[in-house]
Amino acid sequence: SPVPFGPEGRLEDKLHKPKATQTEVKPSVRFNLRTSKDPEHEGCYLSVGHSQPLEDCSFNMTAKTFFIIHGWTMSGIFENWLHKLVSALHTREKDANVVVVDWLPLAHQLYTDAVNNTRVVGHSIARMLDWLQEKDDFSLGNVHLIGYSLGAHVAGYAGNFVKGTVGRITGLDPAGPMFEGADIHKRLSPDDADFVDVLHTYTRSFGLSIGIQMPVGHIDIYPNGGDFQPGCGLNDVLGSIAYGTITEVVKCEHERAVHLFVDSLVNQDKPSFAFQCTDSNRFKKGICLSCRKNRCNSIGYNAKKMRNKRNSKMYLKTRAGMPFRVYHYQMKIHVFSYKNMGEIEPTFYVTLYGTNADSQTLPLEIVERIEQNATNTFLVYTEEDLGDLLKIQLTWEGASQSWYNLWKEFRSYLSQPRNPGRELNIRRIRVKSGETQRKLTFCTEDPENTSISPGRELWFRKCRDGWRMKNETSPTVELP
């Protein structure tokens, strides 16, 4: 398991205790050309200076060449994500060369020792690439290094040491411990390839962050904020708590980066889009759903090459499993007055009705607080494609629906028993689709009735395309 404690380790083992007993460790790296989707097919081992295996195994000099680089291991055997990735690459790029970099002898050690071995493995890969470059028609521009966890930093070293520049490096949740804040030449960084894209799925601001938090590529994508991945909660992963430990949650979140990448290969008709944003909180507010000036991109294999002057942090929401794609909507709700709000924030839900489908009831996450006489922005997302939106139902949850709110209501009543009814006035909701970049305005069905109070709902119908009011101009929108 390429996490510093895997499904077969315990949390307290963390970085120190190797699960494996070593009878012999030789500094050795093997290059296994996977010639079939079949995981049981043995493939061919390539070695520098030996051209025969290239011919015997039909290495295609003009095609794309993928190097898959695993991370730290506690078992000395490849985890199943690796053959899923091999199979997906073969499915998507039928003529490509898919090479698995086997550095198990150097990875099946104490985590700290495995980290210290990443440099030598990077050197081995660079030597292999330098040798391949001596062959006619082989181009470094066609090389794509894909590294998971510790393997992402190995890819960085390889890109740094090779003569020339590799086409692309994809870092799949690059390892955090011993790399967070490290010097640019001691970790994956944007200068290691022509294009470096990174998926971060297990970052933590508290405790041990298995994945690196800092941006290390040209684009750094943080699905679901880069931390808590849907479908990876204790209940989701274990089915029954009796059968597992917190380490399975760790594995689920860390490995999610691989599965998002696999998804981008096999479900290219359902691409997931990420949106540039300064931080996760702003994204959760729905502020960052723009595609202008390269502010959005596909994630995974389909990512468009972007070489920004500085790191570009991008965010998206995902489903709990493949296909991971969701549909993002920015909702701008202008609250033009409210009455007797008291100390509690309202709990709002929306249901979106479209030409293809209707959404479930979706919560509006209030990141800070509802502002009066201001436009409040929210992010909502749906798992299904609703088509063109037709109407919106906005519901204010009644106090009795939440025990916490009920208690606050009761306390509020004790302090001012004659507190009259709480009420908000909303005339319109502006909606922008992240995926289509289309903007729509929804107005209350009854222009005379714009108020909403706890336990009540308000209906909005599409009243115009775009957000333009009188004297407003519409910006040009670039579709993703």
Partner: antibody, heavy 120, light 107 residues
Framework: QVQLVQSGAEVKKPGASVKVSCKAS????????IHWVRQAPGQGLEWMGH????????NNNEKFKDRVTMTRDTSISTAYMELSRLRSDDTAVYYC?????????????WGQGTTVTVSS | DIQMTQSPSSLSASVGDRVTITCRAS??????LNWYQQKPGKAPKLLIS???KLHSGVPSRFSGSGSGTDFTLTISSLQREDFATYYC?????????FGQGTKLEIK
């Protein structure tokens, strides 16, 4: 053709150790992993652990903790499993099995089994 | 550890019968399920890998199906040589675990 040939039956006293060998032929020994699985009389199959012959890295089932040691000699394509501090409930048939490079790979070829009897 | 539960534990059938053995995992094993056949005094033999992939040399009357946590091994028309004990095994997570076995006997 792929073959795994194990050493002969053993009778041991409680507290002693036993070392079982498994000689591989018909394939490249270092390209697959060797696993050890045991079967107590009238019981099911129990995975004990594995060795990666390429470099000798091992991983054991927690149940056997420090009692099992797996080694290999690549020059003669042979894997070994030593079980120490034997108890009567270690009486079983011990199998070596070949497995591919992934967790998911099946045990595609098995040795004939070595009967180990632990009795005072 | 992932628990693998087979049912039935034993089963009597006649030559020519269609037989189904089920295997349930305590959690999702992503279709990483293998089936083995074992005859008395012999080592197990691989029948099916990855839920449904027939191992070379195994007759086509054997088939496997299922997903997630529930899997089945089917013998479409039982032959005399099929009377044996059958085991399922998960390859999703360490430690690798086997079902307790299903003994298939002649009726």
């Amino acid at each position: 053709q792929v073959q795994l040939v194990q050493s002969g039956a053993e009778v041991k006293k409680p507290g002693a150790s036993v070392k079982v060998s498994c000689k591989a032929s018909g394939y490249t020994f270092t390209d697959n992993t060797i696993h050890w699985v045991r079967q107590a009389p009238g019981q099911g199959l129990e995975w004990m652990g594995h060795i990666n012959p390429y470099y000798g890295g091992t991983n054991n089932n927690e149940k056997f903790k420090d009692r099992v040691t797996m080694t290999r000699d690549t020059s003669i394509s042979t894997a070994y499993m030593e079980l120490s501090r034997l108890r009567s409930d270690d009486t079983a048939v011990y199998y070596c099995a070949r497995k591919g490079i992934y967790y998911s790979s099946p045990f595609d070829y098995w040795g004939q089994g070595t009967t180990v009897t632990v009795s005072s | 550890d992932i628990q693998m539960t087979q049912s039935p534990s034993s089963l009597s059938a006649s030559v020519g019968d269609r037989v189904t053995i089920t295997c349930r995992a305590s959690q999702d094993i992503n279709n990483y399920l293998n089936w083995y056949q074992q005859k008395p005094g012999k080592a197990p033999k691989l029948l099916i890998s990855y839920t449904s992939k027939l191992h070379s040399g195994v007759p086509s009357r054997f088939s496997g199906s299922g997903s997630g946590t529930d899997f089945t091994l089917t013998i479409s028309s039982l032959q005399r040589e099929d009377f044996a004990t059958y085991y399922c095994q998960q390859g999703n997570t360490l430690p690798f675990t086997f079902g307790q076995g299903t003994k298939l006997e002649i009726k």
